[in-house]
Amino acid sequence: SETTTGTSSNSSQSTSNSGLAPNPTNATTK
C-alpha cells in the first residue's frame, strides 16, 4: 500500500511512497 507524508504522534515523518507504483511490473520491450 502507499503511505502519504504526514506527521505522526511521535513526531516522526511518514515517508511518502506515492511516487512509485504499488505492484510494479517490468517495462515491456518495444
Epitope: S14, G19, P24
Partner: antibody, heavy 115, light 112 residues
Framework: EVQFVESGGGLVQPGGSLKLSCAAS????????MDWVRQASGKGLEWVAE??????????YYAESVKGRFTISRDDSKSTAYLQMNSLKTEDTAIYYC??????WGQGTLVTVSS | DIVMTQTPLSLSVTIGQPASISCKSS???????????LNWLLQKPGQSPKRLIY???KLDPGIPDRFSGSGSETDFTLKISRVEAEDVGIYYC?????????FGGGTKVEIK
C-alpha cells in the same frame, strides 16, 4: 527532522566487496520503501535497488546491471537499510544515495572501484 | 526499460521570469490503478537530490507553489512561474510506473 545517513563507502579493488548502510532518523522507517540510487561523477542518476516494507513482504527489486551481485536488505529495529555489493566492477564507481522511495534522500557515500 | 528524455539540456533564466522543462517517456506512465507515477527532482549544486513533485502534479510538503507539474501518458512538463536564485541546479524527471525506475538525463537551470 528527517535524516538518512549513508556509510560504508570507500576504495575497493575490482572483484571486491563493500556493504553500505543507511541509518534513518525522524522517519517512520518501517513504512518506508527504501531505494539505493547511484550517480557517477558528473553524470545523471541511476536506480540500483529497492526493498519494500513488511506489508509488502519485504519484496526486493534490482537493476539488471547489479542483479546477482548486489543485495538490498533492511533492519526495521535499527531503522537501517543495507546494500551488500559483491563482485564490484570499475563501472560501479559512483556516489550511492539511499532514499525513502525517492522522497527523502541521504547525502551519499562514495564508492570507488579501482586497482 | 522506459527511456526518459528531457529538454532542454540547459536553461538560462532571468530571476522573476518563468521556466519550463519537458520530459517525454518512451512508454505510457499510466498505471493500472489510474495513477501516473511521474516525479520531478531537483539536485542543487553539491547536494543530494530532493523530490519536488510526485504523480505528475502533486507538490511535496514545503515545495513552493511557484513549481507546478502537468502532463499525461508520455508527455510531461515542469513549470516554474517565477524563477528565484535558489532554484538553480539540475532538474530530473523520473518514472516509477514500470521497473526499472528510470531518470531523465537532467536539465541544468542557471541564472542569466
Amino acid at each position: 527532522e528527517v535524516q538518512f545517513v549513508e556509510s560504508g563507502g570507500g576504495l575497493v579493488q575490482p572483484g571486491g566487496s563493500l556493504k553500505l548502510s543507511c541509518a534513518a532518523s525522524g522517519v517512520t522507517f518501517s513504512e518506508a520503501w527504501m531505494d539505493w540510487v547511484r550517480q557517477a561523477s558528473g553524470k545523471g542518476l541511476e536506480w540500483v535497488a529497492e526493498i519494500r516494507d513488511k506489508p509488502n513482504s519485504y519484496v526486493t527489486y534490482y537493476a539488471e546491471s547489479v542483479k546477482g551481485r548486489f543485495t538490498i536488505s533492511r533492519d526495521d529495529s535499527k531503522s537501517t537499510a543495507y546494500l551488500q555489493m559483491n563482485s564490484l566492477k570499475t563501472e560501479d564507481t559512483a556516489i550511492y544515495y539511499c532514499t525513502g522511495a525517492m522522497d527523502y534522500w541521504g547525502q551519499g557515500t562514495l564508492v570507488t572501484v579501482s586497482s | 526499460d522506459i527511456v526518459m528524455t528531457q529538454t532542454p539540456l540547459s536553461l538560462s533564466v532571468t530571476i522573476g521570469q518563468p521556466a519550463s522543462i519537458s520530459c517525454k517517456s518512451s512508454q505510457s506512465l499510466l498505471y493500472s490503478n489510474g495513477k501516473t507515477y511521474l516525479n520531478w527532482l531537483l539536485q542543487k549544486p553539491g547536494q543530494s537530490p530532493k523530490r519536488l513533485i510526485y504523480q505528475v502534479s502533486k507538490l511535496d510538503p514545503g515545495i513552493p507553489d511557484r513549481f507546478s507539474g502537468s502532463g499525461s501518458e508520455t508527455d510531461f512538463t515542469l513549470k516554474i512561474s517565477r524563477v528565484e536564485a535558489e532554484d538553480v541546479g539540475i532538474y530530473y524527471c523520473m518514472q516509477g510506473s514500470s521497473l526499472p525506475w528510470t531518470f531523465g538525463g537532467g536539465t541544468k537551470v542557471e541564472i542569466k
